[in-house]
């Protein structure tokens, strides 16, 4: 029975950019200005979204698709269809509740966005620290201790299993 | 002595879901950043995901719409919901907590297998 009065409906044939109109007996209107739909047999067209203050427009709306919006020169996206447009730091830094901050000691951002995460634990994988870490870049790890010293086998064992907990680089 | 604790791990299907917990025992507070690291057999150990103290978050490529981070400071605890796993996910999941480079702790490690 549903699928009879689906294709008895007569808004099943109102195309996208247009809405079925109850108003004008159930004939397909087209969107008024700043409208869309974008699949067939709606009764309403949506309101476009309008992109405003620290958005910018990406897209523009048509009657068929919402407009998209992105940020403007420096902030950048955040969430779902950049829903909220968050404030770029330096890289080195992050976004904190009192705005930009350097990263602290031992860790690094090397992105505008996002936050200062800790240097790589070099010793983790048995390696030593080949350079050294700084606030936009993370440290490079190199060969083992091991293997840098004078006259060392060319087979080292594996590094000892280090017993997770206060590990300081 | 502090300890971290993780829970949660597990089989699980790929599609599946998993939620990680990591406690703390011990005196520990005013934790800067929390993060979770995995490693797979015969990989470095890699962050997976961060949040600091403000609630800013950091996420691997691979994982970003799928799992996501939160901690709870009065319980000096944190999570790590993890929805649409693949096999590629598999690995040992750490909890780290990180006050400063001087002073930070590790977890044992939890095994999560996502396989059919």
């Known amino acids: 029975f549903e699928r009879t009065r689906s294709l008895q409906d007569p808004c099943s044939n109102c195309p996208a950019g247009t809405f079925c109109d109850n108003n004008r007996n159930q004939i397909c209107s087209p969107c008024p200005p700043n409208s869309f739909s974008s699949a067939g047999g709606q009764r309403t067209c949506d309101i476009c979204r309008q992109c405003k203050g620290v958005f910018r427009t990406r897209k523009e709306c048509s009657s068929t698709s919402n407009a998209e919006c992105d940020c403007t020169p420096g902030f950048h996206c955040l969430g779902a269809g950049c829903s909220m447009c968050e404030q770029d730091c330096k890289q080195g830094q992050e976004l904190t509740k009192k705005g930009c901050k350097d990263c602290c000691f031992g860790t690094f951002n090397d992105q505008k966005r996002g936050i200062c995460r800790p240097w790589t634990n070099c010793s983790l994988d048995g390696k030593s620290v080949l350079v050294n870490g700084t606030k936009e870049r993370d440290v490079v790890c190199g060969p083992s201790p091991a293997d840098l010293s004078p006259g060392a086998s060319s087979v080292t064992p594996p590094a000892p299993a280090r017993e997770p907990g206060h590990s300081p680089q | 002595a502090v300890q971290l604790v993780e829970s949660g791990g597990g089989l699980v299907q790929p599609g599946g879901s998993l939620r990680l917990s990591c406690a703390a025992s011990?005196?520990?507070?005013?934790?800067?950043?929390m993060g979770w690291y995995r490693q797979a057999p015969g990989k470095q150990r890699e962050l997976v995901a961060m949040?600091?103290?403000?609630?800013?978050?950091y996420y691997l490529d691979s994982v970003k719409g799928r799992f996501t981070i939160s901690r709870d400071n009065a319980k000096i605890a944190m999570y790590l919901q993890m929805n649409s796993l693949k096999s590629e996910d598999t690995a040992v999941y750490y909890c780290?907590?990180?006050?400063?480079?001087?002073?930070?702790?590790w977890g044992k490690g939890t095994q999560v297998t996502v396989s059919s």
């Open positions: 780290h907590y990180w006050i400063s480079h001087e002073m930070n702790y």
């Open positions: 949040i600091n103290s403000s609630g800013g978050t």
């Open positions: 011990g005196s520990i507070f005013s934790i800067d950043r």
